[in-house]
Amino acid sequence: DSEEDEEHTIITDTELPPLKLMHSFCAFKADDGPCKAIMKRFFFNIFTRQCEEFIYGGCEGNQNRFESLEECKKMCTRDNANRIIKTTLQQEKPDFCFLEEDPGICRGYITRYFYNNQTKQCERFKYGGCLGNMNNFETLEECKNICEDGPNGFQVDNYGTQLNAVNNSLTPQSTKVPSLFEFHGPSWCLTPADRGLCRANENRFYYNSVIGKCRPFKYSGCGGNENNFTSKQECLRACKKGFIQRISKGGLIKTKRKRKKQRVKIAYEEIFVKNM
């Protein structure tokens, strides 16, 4: 069973910074398209977390394609290391707080929250259910914690820590955002199976977060939510990345990881390991 096909790897805090995509298309696989030209282009590889060269056929493909290495880096990479402390100490908001609301391309419209830079507050918006950008939060509290200026001159960061304006110390904050040493996979993995509104009976899998396993369900063919996968393997890849727990104060993290490099579900929520 592929569910058991896992190995335990010890990762130090400095090895794997958070994968925070500036644009959802940076998570797309390199796509050479159907045409036969040989054109040198660049794409962002979410596994190596670097911009790499690939050969583009000259037509179609996707947005994860750039004329130059510099353009790719500009669109898809950021200085991940120590970014949270840096932005916190400088009392800056993460870059994505300044992005416009983006409903994405899907049509499973749900209520989400974004930071409205014009009004300087978090507001609800109509989200299509996939893609979009990182200025997109499940709860108002999460949006406020990450993007709004906190009280008393605090800037709250997105890992549940805040800078104390009085003594410059980092103090834990009880928030609904993921804590530093827990893994929270894509948010849709926590939603119940939703067969949708149409009349088909397609075999799909959803992640049951209560039992921690992928289970089959019948999908109607439209609507529903993103906890919906065509195979058990795809479901496991997206949702059962395993919990990450703090082993010691030295910051070692134990994580269940797949042996093979496998395609991940494309979405901005795809955040792997969080560390300071």
Partner: antibody, heavy 119, light 108 residues
């Protein structure tokens, strides 16, 4: 005191259009969503759409997207809803209601405008 | 869209009795996004309960709300004459926002 005052009753023929108004006072018009909800005689409530006047953000119920047009005039703090290609089943009381930008609590409602569609 | 089904359609009770109104959603709705409105004849609806259980300003404590997922309930512990009205549940978790068809609470 927050008030939403709606325009008067309308009698329209099938195929015509109607434009309803909702004048807001007592709060910052641009800082809230304005919703339009209708209620057919003896029926439940049906959400038509919402507009946030400051940036002109609008969300429609797909059912009404092709026939309803929501607009807002910031200078007069008035929201408008135009419904085209009227049919008899559009006969209803149309309400405007405001809600905050963070939730959907429609805490203040207009008095309603009765629209009758009849040949 | 999420369909909200309220039951019963009409509830006939006497003052002093306990009333239980149900609202069932076709798909799961977060409790934060489930509201109730009260409407009396010839009037606009009034916000009554937000976030499943938070009473709006001026709503008496005999009202309470509960539920999660697809099942929600509005309860009135001891009916007063002014409580007789139509109650609508409302969800804003998914677009389009939807209302139940209403439960008419009438005097027996």
């Amino acid at each position: 005191e927050v008030q939403l005052v709606q325009s008067g009753a309308e009698l329209k023929k099938p195929g015509a259009s109607v434009k309803l108004s909702c004048k807001a006072s007592g709060y910052t018009f641009t800082s809230y969503w304005m919703h339009w909800v209708r209620q057919a005689p003896g029926q439940g409530l049906e959400w038509i759409g919402e507009i946030k006047p400051d940036q002109g953000r609008i969300n429609y119920n797909e059912k009404f997207k092709t026939r309803a047009t929501l607009t807002a005039d910031k200078s007069t703090s008035t929201a408008y809803m135009e419904l085209s290609s009227l049919r008899s089943e559009d006969t209803a009381v149309y309400y405007c209601a405001r809600s905050s930008v963070v939730d959907e609590a429609m805490d203040y409602w207009g008095q309603g405008t009765t629209v009758t569609v009849s040949s | 869209e999420i369909v909200l089904t309220q039951s019963p359609a009409t509830l006939s009770l006497s003052p002093g009795e306990r009333a239980t109104l149900s609202c069932s959603a076709s798909s799961s709705v977060s409790s934060s996004y489930l509201y109730w409105y009260q409407q009396k004849p010839g009037q606009a609806p009034r916000l009554w309960i937000s976030g499943t259980s938070i009473l709006a300003s001026g709503v008496p404590a005999r009202f309470s709300g509960s539920g999660s997922g697809t099942k929600y309930t509005l309860t009135i512990s001891s009916l007063e004459p002014e409580d007789f009205a139509v109650y609508f549940c409302h969800q804003w978790s998914h677009y389009p926002f939807t209302f139940g068809q209403g439960t008419k609470l009438e005097i027996k």
